[in-house]
């Protein structure tokens, strides 16, 4: 599993890539299987996670088969394993947030 480091207060971008270079359905979950973010057509959908208004993606990348999860204003408690589900595959990224 990929490990990403982030600093408290910063923004981090977790990557998720599909083999198809086109916009398809994806969603990100945390280790508790709570949905964070996904898509319906050209639109974002958000789940009930604590990240909610700090979570985003980049629609301009979707049609290239890239479905990033952007987390803004990182908090220590955001440290977790994040799972991207796309094309019946799962990609796991471990995020470690450190303070100064």
């Amino acid at each position: 599993k990929k490990v990403v480091l982030g600093k408290k207060g910063d923004t981090v971008e977790l990557t998720c890539t599909a083999s198809q270079k086109k916009s398809i359905q994806f969603h990100w979950k945390n280790s508790n299987q709570i949905k964070i973010l996904g898509n319906q057509g050209s639109f974002l959908t958000k789940g009930p996670s604590k990240l909610n208004d700090r979570a985003d993606s980049r629609r301009s990348l979707w049609d290239q088969g890239n479905f990033p999860l952007i987390i803004k204003n990182l908090k220590i408690e955001d440290s977790d394993t994040y799972i991207c589900e796309v094309e019946d595959q799962k990609e796991e990224v471990q995020l470690l947030v450190f303070g100064l």
Epitope: S42, F43, K46, R54, R59, S60
Partner: antibody
Framework: QVQLVHSGAEVKKPGASVKVSCKAS????????INWVRQATGQGLEWMGW????????GSTQKFQGRVTMTRNTSISTAYMELSSLRSEDTAVYYC??????????????WGKGTTVTVSS | EIVMTQSPATLSLSPGERATLSCRAS???????LSWYQQKPGQAPRLLIY???TRATGIPARFSGSGSGTDFTLTISSLQPEDFAVYYC?????????FGGGTKVEIK
């Protein structure tokens, strides 16, 4: 020029269904979403949902799920919005609007003139 | 869903004056996902601004948008007679898309 042309006004009885059409011209119909937005007299705008003319994929707000069907006919560049189980509160002007995804931005840049639907017994 | 609240409901101003319209989201949204529309009586809405601050094609420079987080503003620097209308903000941060209740700019 780019335009969206609606079907004519409709008067329906409560419980009936209405199907509104929106014919696109001046651009490639399958390259942009069609959104549906309604407006009751003297009220604000209410987004209902969208159809992607290329894939046929649709989505609607929870408020209308089970009551609204959004379809398209690519051969005649026309989108349709059908609303069933009509009630008096559905009396409104129904607009179609072209949805543009430009980079990370999404906006509705071209609107039809709207179809007035009146629900009355 | 995100609730968009616009204020004031009505703004009474004279031609040439500056108009400042406010739009508040019930939760923080990215400025990427905020648009403004103008609607005149008997007409369909017209796109003015997208991405919080980018003017749509053909929109005069007197219209400008700003803001971030939960607070967004549409400013009309010098009102022209054709600017008296209702203005709506709209978010597409996530589904469902939602509009504000509108601000009517009327002639004083």
């Amino acid at each position: 020029q780019v335009q969206l042309v609606h079907s004519g006004a409709e008067v329906k009885k409560p419980g009936a269904s209405v199907k509104v059409s929106c014919k696109a011209s001046g651009y490639t119909f399958t390259s942009y979403d069609i959104n549906w937005v309604r407006q009751a007299t003297g009220q604000g705008l209410e987004w209902m949902g969208w159809v992607n003319p290329n894939s046929g994929n649709t989505g609607s707000t929870q408020k209308f799920q089970g009551r609204v069907t959004m379809t398209r006919n690519t051969s005649i560049s026309t989108a349709y919005m059908e609303l069933s189980s009509l009630r008096s509160e559905d009396t409104a002007v129904y607009y179609c609007a072209r949805g543009v995804l430009k980079g990370d931005y999404y906006y509705m840049d071209v609107w039809g003139k709207g179809t007035t639907v009146t629900v009355s017994s | 869903e995100i609730v968009m609240t616009q204020s004031p409901a009505t703004l009474s101003l004279s031609p040439g004056e500056r108009a400042t319209l406010s739009c508040r989201a019930s939760q923080s949204i990215s400025s990427t996902y905020l648009s403004w529309y103008q609607q005149k009586p008997g007409q369909a809405p017209r796109l003015l601004i997208y991405g919080s601050s980018t003017r749509a094609t053909g929109i005069p420079a007197r219209f400008s948008g700003s803001g971030s987080g939960t607070d967004f503003t549409l400013t009309i620097s010098s009102l022209q007679p054709e600017d008296f209308a209702v203005y709506y903000c709209q978010q597409d941060d996530h589904l469902p898309l939602t509009f504000g209740g509108g601000t009517k700019v009327e002639i004083k």
